[in-house]
Interface confidence: low
């Protein structure tokens, strides 16, 4: 009968030929009376057999990722008679894996949005790399993820590729971060190959800034002839937040005379000082009022950032008009 062990050939061998093993008949007494032949796909081009000994060699570099096994047929013939000594037999040569493929991130580019001031541990995104090497062959396709860029704000779970927040971030200081993730195969052991991907993480705004007046004192004038409802000037606060988190409402905090009102222009986010009652230069030629500004929308959990509203003082001078 036929005698052989399982045949394996490592992929990507740089040698000109590689001895795989021996295929022989147990009737072969080693006197060179038998001739061995190799048939099938790859015979003669990829594999050869020593006609006398049955030793099999790979004569070209193999790529497991291209082809992982070869099915060949062997014959053994008695040279003297030309007859088959054994029935033709089929056998398999398996291409064994080496770590010749780096992990690749197939879904890039990655982008994620996370609210600013999110607590540590908040999940941002999961990145996944794939490795073309054999997952059943050692650790060639077992990946570990690590952070090359993004500390101290982000961390990555080594085995899952889940990116989490590791330090609170303030959108008003920096509104986006580029995180670079490396996937290393061989679970990070020597000989590991790596691939990298970049993740753009954008911070969405939360209402963590209150509006603050640009000036601590505004000086306005109003003619004593001005009718009620007249706009006598504008005041302005700034808010480092954006969108609806920067929408604000102005109001009078202090006006003993109850002569003025403030309305909010929601297009420009300005406060418009309005004359509520007519003024008389001869009766009172100047006024002092205090205005305050608050955000329009403040969720309960963010009230800590809005404890004391910003205020400003407005001095209003009444202009005299000649009266008949």
């Amino acid at each position: 009968g036929w005698v052989w062990n399982q045949f394996f050939v490592p992929e990507e061998m740089n040698t000109t030929s590689h001895h795989i093993g021996q295929l022989r008949s147990d009737l072969d007494n080693g006197n060179n009376s038998f001739q061995y032949k190799l048939l099938g796909a790859g015979a003669g081009s990829t594999f050869i057999i020593d006609e006398r000994t049955g030793d099999i060699y790979a004569i070209q570099k193999l790529d497991r990722e291209e082809r992982s096994l070869y099915i060949l047929r062997a014959q053994v013939i008695d040279i003297a008679t030309g007859r088959a000594v054994e029935p033709e037999s089929e056998f398999v040569i398996k291409v064994s894996d080496i770590n010749d493929n780096e992990p690749k991130f197939l879904d890039e580019p990655y982008e994620a949005i996370v609210p600013e001031m999110s607590p540590e541990g908040t999940l941002v995104i999961q990145v996944t790399a794939s490795d073309a090497d054999d997952p059943s062959s050692g650790n060639n396709a077992r990946l570990l993820y690590s952070l090359l860029q993004g500390q101290p704000y982000f961390s990555v779970e080594p085995t899952t590729g889940v990116i989490r927040i590791s330090s609170k971030m303030d959108r008003e200081l920096q509104d986006e971060y580029w995180v670079i993730i490396q996937a290393k195969d061989m679970i990070g052991q020597p000989g590991a190959l790596s691939g990298t991907t970049s993740v753009l993480i954008k911070l969405s705004d939360v209402n963590d800034n209150k509006p603050i007046f640009k000036e601590s004192l505004y000086r306005l004038t109003v003619s004593e002839s001005a009718p009620t409802g007249t706009s006598i000037g504008t005041i302005m606060a700034y808010d480092n937040d954006i969108g609806e988190n920067a929408e604000m409402d102005y109001s009078i905090e202090e006006d003993d005379s109850q002569t003025f009102d403030i309305i909010t222009n929601h297009e420009t986010q300005e406060g418009i000082v309005i004359l509520k009652k007519k003024v008389d230069f001869e009766h009172q030629n100047h006024y002092g009022i205090r205005a305050k500004v608050k955000n329009h929308h403040v969720p309960e959990q963010l009230m800590k950032y809005h404890t004391e509203a910003s205020t400003t003082f407005i001095k209003i001078q009444v202009e005299d008009v000649d009266e008949p």
Epitope: P109, G195, T196
Partner: antibody, heavy 121, light 107 residues
Framework: EVQLLESGGGLVQPGGSLRLSCAAS????????MNWVRQAPGKGLEWVST????????YYADSVKGRFTISSDNSKSTLYLQMNSLRAEDTAVYHC??????????????WGQGTTVTVSS | EIVMTQSPVTLSLSLGERATLSCRAS??????LAWFQQKPGQAPRLLIY???TRATGIPARVSGSGSGTEFTLTISSLQSEDFAVYYC?????????FGGGTKVEIK
């Protein structure tokens, strides 16, 4: 501080040979890929060859394949470029450049000042 | 071979102006692109890698963007030290290839 110092350039006749060296310091030489890049007079940059940190993998531009050989000696922290069958079009300043983190993935982060190779009869 | 095409060849600008340099790859190279600056008689200097990440010591006025085949290097406000030749380089595929360069000169 990372430093790369090329040497070995000079005047050579067409068909001749030269061996360029690049002495590296300030980093773990064996952990990084190394590159040779050249620049012909008044021209742009042209990649020539790369060797991986362990020296297992080598890559060449088609214009030098079969004529140039890149190698490294980790014990000496030195990169080499053996140039054979030199041609007039090989005349250039040859720079060695250190690979970045992760081998080849971050480009060439530090460059040497270069050594001049002139091929002329 | 990936062909890298830079435009314009020359950019004439004044101090303080914004410089926008383009680089196009003949096929997608993901974000595996680097930008280098070179001054006469000096070695190239890495500015940007990974298409958008600034190298150590590169000022914030220098930024990179793009992915796939179209990339841009922007210098928001040109300083005297920014007048030089700029090269893009792809390292996604072998062989590594450089663009032909863009010279940024004083107007």
């Amino acid at each position: 501080e990372v430093q790369l110092l090329e040497s070995g350039g000079g005047l050579v006749q067409p068909g001749g040979s030269l061996r360029l060296s690049c002495a590296a310091s300030g980093f773990t030489f064996s952990s990084y890929a190394m590159n040779w890049v050249r620049q012909a007079p008044g021209k742009g940059l042209e990649w020539v060859s790369t060797i991986s940190g362990g020296g297992a993998n080598t890559y060449y531009a088609d214009s030098v394949k079969g004529r140039f050989t890149i190698s490294s000696d980790n014990s000496k922290s030195t990169l080499y470029l053996q140039m054979n069958s030199l041609r007039a079009e090989d005349t250039a300043v040859y720079h060695c450049a250190k690979g970045g983190m992760g081998g080849y993935y971050y480009g060439m982060d530090v460059w040497g000042q270069g050594t001049t190779v002139t091929v002329s009869s | 071979e990936i062909v890298m095409t830079q435009s314009p060849v020359t950019l004439s600008l004044s101090l303080g102006e914004r410089a926008t340099l383009s680089c196009r790859a003949s096929q997608s190279i993901s974000s595996n692109l680097a930008w280098f600056q070179q001054k006469p008689g000096q070695a190239p200097r890495l500015l940007i890698y990974g298409a958008f990440t600034r190298a150590t010591g590169i000022p914030a006025r220098v930024s990179g963007s793009g992915s796939g085949t179209e990339f841009t290097l922007t210098i928001s406000s040109l300083q005297s030290e920014d007048f030089a030749v700029y090269y893009c380089q792809q390292y996604n595929y072998w062989p590594l290839t450089f663009g032909g360069g863009t010279k940024v000169e004083i107007k």
